[in-house]
Interface confidence: low
Amino acid sequence: QQQTLPKPFIWAEPHFMVPKEKQVTICCQGNYGAVEYQLHFEGSLFAVDRPKPPERINKVQFYIPDMNSRMAGQYSCIYRVGELWSEPSNLLDLVVTEMYDTPTLSVHPGPEVISGEKVTFYCRLDTATSMFLLLKEGRSSHVQRGYGKVQAEFPLGPVTTAHRGTYRCFGSYNNHAWSFPSEPVKLLVTGDIENTSLAPEDPTFPADTWGTYLLTTETGLQKDHALWDHTAQNLLR
């Protein structure tokens, strides 16, 4: 006999990186017929929603109107159908950004390199932090974590055209409180010996959405959002 229901998906809209004082919605998608959803924050019950009518709704939303450092942390959700509860969702790491200061990102030996050349990004922030995050616009799997008291090095190694794209970095005051984003640095890689045609960049989110971190595709499925966020958060952990 089935003891639990499948776990729901959890994600944040517009994104799990939320500028302080901005709004965010935590979404939990379970099954039609679920009579109750519970949102847990840092292991404790945070909010409850009971959709009406349950047979026509498979998703609930928990709205946070004013993001701050106290609201940043790990969220999960569960739902029940009748008396049967689901497995808990994956953890959603909700991050507050635009805290305190702005790092500077540079790339060495430069933003225009030949394929095969070794490239290193440097993210610098003079205020007290020890963890840095390098993000490439596009797939969230391009998240790297680095450490240093004022600067972190992010060696990409010998690059290929797959490394082309726009990068930003953040300083992290803790796992869930990040700095303002750096200005963008666009890496151009030319002369790929293995593939002389200009390979397309990874599927990317709209470049102009970085300012507000609306890194979600307009046509993307909700589950895609959830998986996207979860991939990035696993890398952060």
């Epitope: 500077t104 540079s106 030996p109 430069g110 933003p111 240093g148 004022v150 600067q151 200005e183 963008p184």
Partner: antibody, heavy 115, light 107 residues
């Protein structure tokens, strides 16, 4: 407070070598990138070399293959080994601290290459 | 390498004047620009980094602006101690490169 004290400059004949030192204090030396910048008499600033906290090094084309930057983190000291010197290398040499922008500078040391 | 071009190469101004120095990069450098002040016989002093961020201890009459290729250093009200040579430097890529300098002289 942060201090960078330079030594090792002087008069040297063309083709000879010289080693400059920069003793650092007042900060955690091995956390920072360190640069050498030079200034020929009456001229502007010219970047020479950098060594990052991770150990990677870069050089200006004008000194590549002749100059070597190094650091001894146990002694909080930065070095510039200059070989095959020519008259064009005559300048005041500054060490400086910083990753990209140069926050603190040494007092400078004059290197004169002349026969 | 990225070339940095400053203008003017020199200027004469009086105490209290508003002074503007420009710096142009040969390619886009985002906001990766620093400004330094140098007085004769002394080491340069950092004034501005990341185009507009004032270094600690630098008077607020100094300000920086710009992004991409065009940048400006402004001294809102020139003081006697501000007569010096000013350099811009891009910190976008290696090698970092300096402008040729702008000498601010007393009129």
């Amino acid at each position: 407070q942060v201090q960078l004290v330079q030594s090792g400059g002087g008069l040297v004949q063309p083709g000879r070598s010289l080693r400059l030192s920069c003793a650092a204090s007042g900060f955690t030396f091995d956390d920072y990138a360190m640069h050498w910048v030079r200034q020929a008499p009456g001229e502007g600033l010219e970047w020479v070399s950098v060594i990052y906290s991770g150990g990677s090094t870069y050089y200006a084309d004008s000194v590549k293959g002749r100059f070597t930057i190094s650091r001894d983190n146990s002694k909080n000291t930065l070095y510039l080994q200059m070989n095959s010197l020519s008259a064009e290398d005559t300048a005041v040499y500054y060490c400086a601290r910083g990753a990209q922008w140069l926050v603190n500078w040494g007092q400078g040391t004059l290197v004169t290459v002349s026969s | 390498d990225i070339q940095m071009t400053q203008s003017p190469s020199s200027l004469s101004a009086s105490v209290g004047d508003r002074v503007t120095i420009t710096c142009r990069a040969s390619q886009g450098i985002s906001n990766a620009l620093a400004w330094y002040q140098q007085k004769p016989g002394k080491a340069p002093k950092l004034l501005i980094y990341a185009a507009s961020r004032l270094e600690s201890g630098v008077p607020s009459r100094f300000s920086g602006s710009g992004s991409g290729t065009d940048f400006t250093l402004t001294i809102s009200s020139l003081q006697p101690e501000d007569f010096a040579t000013y350099y811009c430097q891009q910190h976008y890529s290696t090698p970092p490169t300096f402008g040729q300098g702008t000498k601010v002289e007393i009129k």
